[in-house]
Interface confidence: low
């Protein structure tokens, strides 16, 4: 899908005269038709398979058309196409004189034509015009053309069809040829994945936007590769989730028995010697003259 | 034209589960994106879940593992599973389908058209 447009720039009839030679009363009213069909060797009559288009009276005699004085308010002129651009083409262009306010073919008298101009060739696909002018005994006109797509479609032929979007279902913008183009922090076919902070764990982390790292069950941390351990645990860690390695000097099922109860409570007095033994469990060993179970005595 | 029709709504209890169908009449692509939206009353209407190209699904974080969207697209139709309902799932369940269409005149450009079903009420009892 994509547009055919047509850049009328400035026509010359310095007689102010017919095709027929004769002249227009009082000057010719000067409005133009514009047929866009399939290429032709030889540009024949028949139906204008690629489009038509008719402006209004755009001067008289001689004059330069406006950016935007052609085909009711538009100049270029507008030939839309809704397949897939055959890159060739052949274009004619009839310049009329209106008598009178009807511009209808049928209002017309047969003899009202001015000139009639017939191109053929190729045309790729572009941004850039071509520049034309034809020229007969009579008039000159000068114009330039080109092709582009329509909004959305893309490619040498307009083909192709791509909606930059940034919702639940993509998020992109579309290059030039139509692939697309995948906006920052995200990725994939249609680009839907985001990309993760940097360094979140591919497997223990996640993320629903970019730059984000979601842990899952059992980790966390900036980068989700810290293990959780289960809850009870008091003085251990983990190397997989909910387990509870016991730190040194704690056991139990929770790691919350104190296995160096000497060390960190102290217990026996008077120089006596401590050993642990057990969960909470310790010996005072006294010296000669104490006694108690701390050798507190 | 595209027209679509749900059903498969209705009264359940808590915990219980509906699937709710969708089917589409007119010219449907299977690259089309489809999904499900609600509306409770007095709320804004909402994405629930959404089925996209190469059948990759999005879902709302409210209904994540409970809610399944499915596409059979020989039949033009979209199903949303619904287990484990609450409560707060009651609202008006609309389908919607995107369609590219060209538009004529103007600036000959291509629209797409989100084109809504009638909605199907779900009401999920406590």
């Known amino acids: 899908s994509g547009v055919f447009q047509l850049q009328l720039q400035e026509f010359i009839n310095e007689r102010g005269v017919l095709a027929s030679g004769r002249p227009c009363e009082p000057g010719c009213r000067t409005f133009f038709r514009v047929c866009l069909k399939h290429f032709q060797a030889v540009v024949s009559p028949g139906p204008c398979t690629f489009g038509t288009v008719s402006t209004p009276v755009l001067g008289t005699n001689s004059f330069a058309v406006r950016d935007d004085s052609s085909g009711g308010g538009r100049n270029p002129l507008q030939l839309p196409f809704n397949f897939t651009w055959p890159g060739t083409f052949s274009l004619i262009i009839e310049a009329w004189h209106a008598p009178g306010d009807d511009l209808r073919p049928e209002a017309l008298p047969p003899d009202a034509l001015i000139s009639k101009i017939a191109i053929q060739g190729s045309l790729a696909v572009g941004q850039n015009w071509l520049l034309d002018e034809q020229t007969s005994t009579l008039t000159r006109l000068r114009y330039s053309y080109r092709v582009i797509c329509s909004d959305n479609y893309y490619g040498d032929n307009c083909s192709r069809l791509c909606k930059k979007r940034n919702d639940h279902f993509g998020h992109y913008v579309c290059q030039p040829d139509g692939n697309l183009s995948c906006l920052p922090g995200w990725t994939g076919e249609y680009c839907q994945q985001p990309i993760c902070l940097s360094g979140c764990h591919e497997q223990n982390g996640y993320c629903s936007k970019p730059a984000e790292c979601l842990c899952r069950p059992g980790w966390q941390g900036r980068l989700c590769n810290e293990c959780i351990p289960h809850n009870g645990c008091r003085h251990g860690t983990c190397s997989t989730p909910w387990q509870c390695t016991c730190d040194e000097g704690w056991g139990g099922l929770f790691c919350d028995q104190d296995l160096n109860y000497c060390t960190h409570h102290s217990p026996c007095k008077n120089g006596a010697t401590c050993s642990n033994s057990g969960q909470r469990s310790y010996t005072c060993t006294c010296r000669p003259g104490y006694t108690g179970v701390d050798c507190e005595l | 034209q595209v027209q679509l029709q749900e059903s498969g709504g209705g009264l359940v209890q808590a915990g219980g589960s509906l699937r709710l169908s969708c089917a589409a009449s007119g010219n449907i692509s299977t690259g089309t994106a489809m999904g499900w939206y609600r509306q409770a009353p007095g709320k804004e209407r909402e994405f629930v879940a959404g089925?996209?190209?190469?059948?990759?699904?999005y879902y709302a974080d409210s209904v994540k593992g409970r809610f399944t969207i499915s596409r059979d697209n020989a039949k033009n139709t979209v199903y949303l599973q619904m287990n484990s309902l609450k409560p707060e799932d009651t609202a008006v369940y609309y389908c919607?389908?995107?369609?590219?269409?060209?538009?004529?005149?103007?600036?000959?450009?291509?629209?797409?058209?989100?084109?809504w079903g009638q909605g199907t009420q779900v009401t999920v009892s406590s």
């Open positions: 919607a389908v995107e369609v590219s269409q060209s538009t004529p005149g103007g600036r000959y450009s291509v629209a797409y058209l989100i084109y």
């Open positions: 089925i996209a190209y190469g059948a990759t699904t």
